[in-house]
């Protein structure tokens, strides 16, 4: 999916209002220095591309992020503010249903969410730079 035509301001508002709080809740008990951020993003479409991939693509070490509250809100936000996004996400919905079975928060999932927080923060910064 090409995120170029999204309403970035609306996505930022949704992130600041709800998604960020859910991410921070998920990370509760860990310090921001506990994990080393190894990925970043260049501009707003790039940030959303990587956020979408990291949130919904299961990885061998962390297969269950898609069922989390922040992931559901991310999906809803992208569907709302990115034209045509929801039509591209049928496979992602199947992945979420499969992932719903396990509820263990592993250290690797915490690390992945730490990376997500970094990508979201970069998204906000690139937005500020453009204004």
């Amino acid at each position: 999916y090409d995120f170029t035509n999204c309403d970035f301001q609306k996505i930022e508002a949704d992130y600041l209002r709800t998604i960020s709080k859910d991410l921070i809740t998920y990370m509760s008990g860990t310090k921001s220095t506990d994990f080393n951020n190894t990925v970043s993003c260049s501009n707003r479409p790039h940030c959303l591309t990587e956020i979408q991939s990291l949130t919904f693509n299961p990885t061998p070490r962390c297969a269950s992020l898609a069922k989390e509250m922040f992931a559901r809100k991310t999906k809803a936000t992208l569907a709302l503010w990115c034209p045509g996004y929801s039509e591209t996400q049928i496979n992602a919905t199947q992945a979420m249903k499969k992932a719903r079975k396990s509820k263990v928060t592993t250290n690797k999932c915490l690390e992945q969410v730490s990376q997500l927080l970094g990508l979201w923060r970069r998204f906000i910064r690139t937005l500020l730079k453009k204004q």
Partner: antibody, heavy 117, light 108 residues
Framework: QVQLQESGPGLVKPSETLSLTCAVS?????????WSWIRQPPGKGLEWIGY???????SYNPSLKSRVTISRDTSKNQFSLKLSSVTAADTAVYYC??????????WGQGTLVTVSS | EIVMTQSPATLSLSPGERATLSCRAS??????LAWYQQKPGQAPRLLIY???SRATGIPARFSGSGSGTDFTLTISSLEPEDFAVYYC??????????FGQGTKVEIK
């Protein structure tokens, strides 16, 4: 200390597919970062080809997108480049590199690929 | 596509002298700029990222500055091992990351 090592044929015929592999040691490619390919024609500058991230997202240079495939094999801790329909203009030293999806902090030593019949 | 233009193409200096290399972007890249050093027969090495942050293990004599379209790499006092080709790279315009054509720093 992460180390990257490119391997593959040094000579490819025009119209065929160039295939290279980058073996990574000292770091798991499924643990973090992105894993990228960059090339440098003899005596010329650098050109970014694309990357695959540790979680599987893939991004390509638009000028090469129609001909490029980057994939990975996490069990072997390596990633690969395929470039189809090559011409003499694809003759270059091909580098693999570790990236944070923005810039490139560790590089392989490079491998020269010549396209010639 | 953002075009990166480096100047001069060649810089002839003696060890101990100060080197000032320029990189100009065809449109603003904010501070999304990196500098690399490449010696003959070797891979490039990351020197500077985010326009002014030194990469791990890079000596303090290397410094970067600039924002927007104009950037500078300064080597305060050239060491014999600093004679090489230097490239700038913008990473503001995903998915079209581009490099400059390089500046060769040679011994005078």
């Amino acid at each position: 200390q992460v180390q990257l090592q490119e391997s593959g044929p040094g000579l490819v015929k025009p119209s065929e597919t160039l295939s290279l592999t980058c073996a990574v040691s000292g770091y798991s490619i499924s643990s973090g970062y992105g894993w990228s390919w960059i090339r440098q024609p003899p005596g010329k500058g650098l050109e970014w080809i694309g990357y695959i991230s540790y979680y599987g997202s893939i991004s390509y240079n638009p000028s090469l997108k129609s001909r490029v495939t980057i994939s990975r094999d996490t069990s072997k801790n390596q990633f690969s480049l395929k470039l189809s329909s090559v011409t003499a203009a694809d003759t270059a030293v091909y580098y693999c590199a570790r990236t944070n999806l923005l810039y490139f902090d560790s590089w392989g030593q490079g491998t020269l690929v010549t396209v010639s019949s | 596509e953002i075009v990166m233009t480096q100047s001069p193409a060649t810089l002839s200096l003696s060890p101990g002298e100060r080197a000032t290399l320029s990189c100009r972007a065809s449109q603003s890249v904010s501070n999304n700029l990196a500098w690399y050093q490449q010696k003959p027969g070797q891979a490039p090495r990351l020197l500077i990222y985010d326009a002014s942050s030194r990469a791990t293990g890079i000596p303090a004599r290397f410094s970067g500055s600039g924002s927007g379209t104009d950037f500078t790499l300064t080597i305060s006092s050239l060491e014999p091992e600093d004679f090489a080709v230097y490239y700038c790279q913008q990473y503001s315009d995903w998915p079209q990351y581009t490099f400059g054509q390089g500046t060769k720093v040679e011994i005078k």
